[in-house]
């Protein structure tokens, strides 16, 4: 039953004298394992005996012999689905078919596989894509109907009979389906490779020649252009004549188109390989470039650079930069159309000749305000001299300068006067635009730049304004010379340096903080009484009575000032002491006497101390002593002790009589 | 080894046309481009273009090509070149060339006179 | 097109001298995958047609006496006989070959 029996493999396997020949093959026998398989060469089938004649070049039996003669070819499959077969080597005679006969227990088969071995190793084939275009990668396909596990070999690729640089990837295939050996070369072809030619060479695993494919590339590749110019350097002075000439180097396919471009710009009506400028200006300087299409697109032309030589044009002066700060630096540039550029400059500053300045470009370092003015330049080449443009205005920008403060009023100024001052300046660019005035205060700015004050103080030392643009000058400070009275005027005590007491030397002296002038008088007083007219008051010996209230008077030409009253105070031990009795020194028994001990004492008396006639101290200690009701006995002289913490003073004797009461003489 | 064989000296008149041709042997045929190039008597070679085989792409000299045309047959491994409105300064020996990487193979040459 | 310019137009010279003749090309024909020059000398003598004598500038062709030998790289070059023979009086012609095909004007070489 042949419908049993499904082979897959090459239809047709290629191969050359001495190489080898590897057939994979599958099948499938539906009623079970193989049992005897032979491979013939060109079998034909014999009516009369029912069976295949033909060469046999492989058989295996039952028992699995195989003859030693069969080793050239191997069968490498098995009894149920591998059918593969290698011929090592082939030879040419082995063309043909070969017939693979299989049975299995109940079928038989034959299946024709077509065997081409060729004298020589046959070329590989090159496939090349439809269109090759300039500088888009291609693939080059390097394609052998040929492989074979014990027959290695290589493909290479040559260009102009040189190995390509790029490298390629070789695959092989060795399936039921096809059998090649593949090179795929990748590379992105210039417009060079246009007509270049490309092989494919096989080599066995030696590197030795078996064969090759060759091609011509046709890179299809935009117009390449070469331009060439008269005079060849392309300077030309103005009225000169130039051509220009595009000389197609390769184009393909075939140029369509030609125009001319200057500075990118298409040249209008000019459609020939020649362009032709006649009596050329100065403004047909520029790039040129030849433009040449073809079906793949525009080829330009490298650019030619027209020169076309003049005489400097009138020049300009750029400033950088305007206004300028002074202490700042300053370039002037010299600009002037010309052609070749100018060598000679000639710098003039307000009209008048900058001498030295020979250069495109004025640097100063340094601007100072009389650098200020109007820069204008002559520029010079080989062709001549230009004209002199309306050049440039340099602004020198400073603060104010010379900025001083002035006094308005007559001096001296006195404390209390209204003071005004104006704040002056030599010059200023910009223009003053406000002030500033040191120190601040709630002064009135009547007009720009002049500052009153009303009742000017004392201590108004100084005064400084600046005058401001864009920055502000400062004057140095003015000094108001305020004159003023002696101020603070107070007494001091200069000894003794504790407390004053009676008999102690006192010194006492006017002091005062400032006076302006400095020239003063002094005056002492006290209670309304003239002193003394120096700065001290002295006492030798300080008594009681010198205590009071003293002030002292400083003067100048603008006025005097006292002090505060100051109290002198002496300190002295009690003094002047008396008993005083009260009612009297004659007292009735049983009534009440009152016996005060009366002083004088700085400070006051702190402990009294009373005495009888007997100069025995009672036990009292007040400054009274108050007997109630008094005795006849109490009949007697008293006296007092006080002290404070000077010292202590005592008073004379004092009689106090006590007389009997009219019911103690009525009991006698 | 390689060979161009062209065909035999042509005589035309003025305006008419001649196709000339160049066998080829001994290689590839379609892996080499094939050229034309013309000697007028006592004047310089003259390329007029080439046929590439494989594709049958052209490409002509500009100063031929509303005139020539050349074309191939692979299976004959034949190119011809066709020149029309033929004028007496066409007169001129034509050769089919073609280049190796480190060779060039000439025909023996077909000479055209154009007379009338 | 480039334009190949060879000069001079002719000379005569004795058996045995040396001659050298010039190709000057519009364009460089360098080609710089493999850095050859691509231009080719040919002889040609009446009737015949040219005949190669050098490639790639400067190599000669195999079969080619070595009196002849060719120089120069991108738009110049120079082909020399060493010793001029009777046999070398032909026209000689410049060709490059790197873009299309262009050839010089010819060289006569007449022997005195």
């Known amino acids: 039953d042949s419908s049993k029996w499904v082979f897959e493999h090459p239809e047709t396997l290629y191969a050359w004298e001495g190489a080898c020949v590897w057939i994979p093959c599958t099948y499938r026998a539906l009623d079970g394992d193989l049992e005897s398989f032979i491979l013939f060469h060109n079998p034909e089938y014999n009516k009369n005996t029912s069976k295949f004649d033909g060469t046999r070049l492989y058989e295996s039996t039952k028992d699995g012999k195989v003859p030693s003669e069969q080793k050239r070819v191997q069968f490498l499959g098995d009894k149920n689905k591998n059918c593969t077969l290698s011929i090592h080597p082939v030879h040419l005679n082995d063309s043909g078919q070969l017939g693979l006969r299989m049975e299995s227990k109940t079928e038989k088969w034959m299946e024709r596989i077509h065997l081409n071995v060729s004298e020589r190793p046959f070329p590989p084939h090159i496939q090349l894509p439809p269109e090759i275009q300039e500088s888009q990668e291609v693939t080059l396909t390097c394609l052998l109907n040929f492989s074979c596990y014990g027959y290695p070999i290589q493909l290479q690729w040559l260009l102009e009979g040189v190995p390509m640089r790029q490298a390629a990837v070789t695959s092989t295939s060795l399936t039921i389906k096809s059998v090649f050996t593949r090179s795929e070369l990748k590379f992105s072809p210039q417009w060079s490779h246009h007509g270049k030619i490309v092989t494919c060479q096989l080599q066995d695993a030696d590197g030795k020649f078996l064969s090759n494919d060759t091609v011509q590339l046709n890179v299809k590749h935009t117009p390449k252009l070469e331009i060439k110019v008269t005079p060849s350097d392309a300077i030309v002075r103005e009225g000169d004549s130039v051509t220009m000439t595009c000389e197609v180097s390769s184009s393909n396919p075939e140029y369509t188109t030609v125009s001319w471009l200057k500075d990118g710009t298409s040249l209008k009506k000019q459609n020939t390989f020649t362009l032709n400028l006649r009596e050329v200006t100065k403004d047909q300087s520029g790039k040129y470039c030849c433009q040449v299409s073809n079906d793949v697109g525009p080829g330009r032309s490298e650019e030619v650079f027209l020169q076309v030589q003049y005489a400097p044009e009138p020049s300009t002066v750029q400033i950088l930069h305007s206004p300028a700060v002074e202490g700042s630096q300053v370039e002037f540039l010299c600009m002037s159309l010309a052609n070749p550029l100018p060598t000679n400059y000639t710098w003039y500053h307000n009209g008048k000749e900058m001498q030295g300045r020979t250069e495109e470009k004025v640097h100063i370092p340094k601007i100072l305000p009389w650098h200020a003015g109007t820069y204008s330049c002559v520029a010079e080449n080989i062709l001549g001299t230009g004209q002199r443009g309306p050049g440039a205005e340099l602004d020198v920008q400073y603060p104010p300068k010379k900025v001083t403060t002035v006094i308005q009023n007559p001096m001296p100024i006195r404390e209390g006067d209204t003071v005004t001052l104006s704040c002056n300046y030599n010059s200023s660019n910009p223009s003053v635009t406000r002030y500033e005035w040191k120190p601040h205060g709630a002064w009135e700015e009547p007009s720009l730049g002049v500052l009153k004050i009303q009742n000017v103080g004392w201590d108004n030392t100084t005064i400084a304004c600046a005058a401001c643009n864009s920055w502000c000058s400062w004057a140095s400070p003015v000094a108001l010379n305020v004159q003023y009275a002696p101020r603070d005027v107070r007494v001091r005590k200069i000894k003794p340096l504790s407390e004053i007491h009676s008999g102690n030397s006192v010194s006492l002296q006017c002091d005062f903080s400032s006076s302006h002038p400095k020239e003063v008088q002094f005056f002492w007083e006290k209670n309304g009484r003239l002193l003394g007219k120096e700065s001290q008051l002295n006492f030798d010996s300080i008594s009681p009575e010198d205590a009071g209230s003293y002030s002292c008077w400083v003067n100048n030409s603008i006025g005097q000032t006292a002090s505060k009253a100051w109290t002198l105070e002496v300190l002295y031990a009690p003094r002047r002491l008396r008993v005083s009795m009260s009612p009297g020194d004659q007292v009735m028994e049983g009534k009440s006497a009152t016996l005060t001990c009366e002083s004088d004492a700085n400070p006051p008396v702190s402990h009294y101390t009373w005495f009888d006639w007997n100069n025995q101290s009672l036990p009292y200690h007040s400054q009274k002593l108050r007997l109630e009701p008094v005795k006849v006995q109490h009949s007697g002289a008293y006296w007092c002790q006080g002290t404070n913490s000077v010292g202590k003073g005592r008073s004379p004797l004092s009689t106090l009589t006590v007389y009997y009461s009219p019911e103690t003489i009525g009991r006698r | 080894q390689v060979q161009l064989q062209q065909s035999g000296a042509e005589v035309k008149k003025p305006g008419a046309s001649v196709k000339m041709s160049c066998k080829a042997s001994g290689y590839t045929f379609t892996s080499y481009w094939l050229h034309w190039v013309r000697q007028a008597p006592g004047q310089r070679l003259e390329w007029m273009g080439y046929i590439n085989p494989r594709n049958d792409y052209t490409e002509y000299n500009q100063n031929f090509k509303d005139r020539v045309t050349i074309t191939a047959d692979t299976s004959a491994s034949t190119a011809y070149m066709e020149l029309s409105s033929l004028r007496s300064e066409d007169t001129a020996v034509y050769y089919c060339a073609r280049r190796d990487i480190t060779t060039f193979y000439w025909g023996q040459g077909t000479t055209l006179t154009v007379s009338s | 097109d480039i334009v190949l310019t060879q000069s001079p137009d002719s000379l005569a010279v004795s058996a045995g001298e040396r001659v050298t003749m010039n190709c000057k090309s519009s364009?460089?024909?360098?080609?710089?995958?493999?850095?050859?020059?691509?231009l080719a000398w040919y002889q040609q003598k009446p009737g015949q047609p040219p005949k190669l004598l050098i490639y790639?500038?400067?190599t000669r062709e195999s079969g080619v006496p070595d009196r002849f030998s060719g120089s120069g790289s991108g738009t110049d070059f120079t082909l020399t006989i060493s010793s001029v023979q009777a046999e070398d009086v032909a026209i000689y012609y410049c060709?490059?070959?790197?873009?299309?095909?262009?050839f010089g004007g010819g060289t006569k070489l007449e022997i005195k």
């Open positions: 790639w500038a400067s």
């Open positions: 364009q460089s024909v360098l080609y710089s995958a493999n850095h050859k020059n691509y």
């Open positions: 060709h490059q070959y790197l873009s299309s095909w262009t």
